[in-house]
Amino acid sequence: GSERTCCPVNWVEHERSCYWFSRSGKAWADADNYCRLEDAHLVVVTSWEEQKFVQHHIGPVNTWMGLHDQNGPWKWVDGTDYETGFKNWRPEQPDDWYGHGLGGGEDCAHFTDDGRWNDDVCQRPYRWVCETELDKASQEPPLL
């Protein structure tokens, strides 16, 4: 079933979540779907501490996260509230830039080479990070 008490093989545990770091690139939608089929979601960054953890593992490489505004407002893929939540945009970002010549603006968020966030064309083949939460029941310390 989907109830998890420990991370799958090749996933990294951190603060009761499990993370998987890709080494290839996909468009945002394909990365999003890849995570779903692993019973996970594209990483949702909720704190500076989580930001630093992810940044440490991905290095200076453009990497998709689970944040997009394809339907208007910015949304995290797991429903975490964007407006009140953690943000780490680069200065002047997001800018929904249309000057790339690829059609449309920029609707998907990624970590840049310095870890701060940028919005970019969702079709770009960037690396990605999947995240899945461990169950609350498994967070309780064992009875002695």
């Epitope: 989907s2 779903r36 089929l37 019973d39 996970a40 979601h41 429903g79 899945t132």
Partner: antibody, heavy 121, light 107 residues
Framework: EVQLLESGGGLVQPGGSLRLSCAAS????????MSWVRQAPGKGLEWDSA????????YYADSVKGRFTISRDNSKNTLYLQMNSLRAEDTAVYYC??????????????WGQGTLVTVSS | DIQMTQSPSSLSASVGDRVTITCRAS??????LAWYQQKPGKVPKLLIY???TLQSGVPSRFSGSGSGTDFTLTISSLQPEDVATYYC?????????FGPGTKVDIK
């Protein structure tokens, strides 16, 4: 034992609204995505919508997008389908189905008995 | 969207026969395919997922194979209780589309 019990079906006029409910028991409801799947009389299965375990993300078939809204109340172990602007072609038995994953693998290991929705004037 | 087709739409076979149902996706879906059995007047039951993994409690006479666009459900020795409609379903991405079904009965 996993149990899914749908309710809320009935006769409604075209353009009308209906809210279906699915009461779940026998498993940790919030740990699983859920879907609604319909079956018109004498026809095959048609997936309508899905919602992930924490309720934070939804998926819809094009045929219901903008008309139907899936939601859940994990404190009540209940799944909902709000159906607006109903059409004759929405007439079907509506099943709620339990996904095998939290973030919606998209296939279903338990199904309710279904509730019949009839759209007719 | 990806379309799912099944063949045949119906078949009759004798008890003990080997029965094969095929499912085809209009585009590749890797092995993200499930099979369901729906007996008359009953709710669907999951038989197989990831194309070939048998769901717990499903008799071993059922098996699945295939990848990409072409998939097969096989009943190695048809039993009277296997009279049902069988549906394939793709779940590689939403929408999670079902095939039109194959009705199986006994000669």
């Amino acid at each position: 034992e996993v149990q899914l019990l749908e309710s809320g079906g009935g006769l409604v006029q075209p353009g009308g609204s209906l809210r279906l409910s699915c009461a779940a028991s026998g498993f940790t409801f919030s740990s699983y995505a859920m879907s609604w799947v319909r079956q018109a009389p004498g026809k095959g299965l048609e997936w309508d919508s899905a919602i992930i375990g924490n309720g934070g993300r939804t998926y819809y078939a094009d045929s219901v997008k903008g008309r139907f809204t899936i939601s859940r109340d994990n404190s009540k172990n209940t799944l909902y389908l709000q159906m607006n602007s109903l059409r004759a072609e929405d007439t079907a038995v509506y099943y709620c189905a339990k996904d095998m994953g939290r973030y919606s693998y998209g296939f279903f290991d338990y199904w309710g008995q279904g509730t019949l929705v009839t759209v007719s004037s | 969207d990806i379309q799912m087709t099944q063949s045949p739409s119906s078949l009759s076979a004798s008890v003990g026969d080997r029965v094969t149902i095929t499912c085809r996706a209009s585009q590749g879906i890797s092995n993200y395919l499930a099979w369901y059995q729906q007996k008359p007047g009953k709710v669907p039951k999951l038989l197989i997922y990831v194309a070939s993994t048998l769901q717990s409690g499903v008799p071993s006479r059922f098996s699945g194979s295939g990848s990409g666009t072409d998939f097969t459900l096989t009943i190695s020795s048809l039993q009277p209780e296997d009279v049902a409609t069988y549906y394939c379903q793709k779940y590689n991405s939403a929408p999670f589309t079902f095939g039109p079904g194959t009705k199986v009965d006994i000669k």
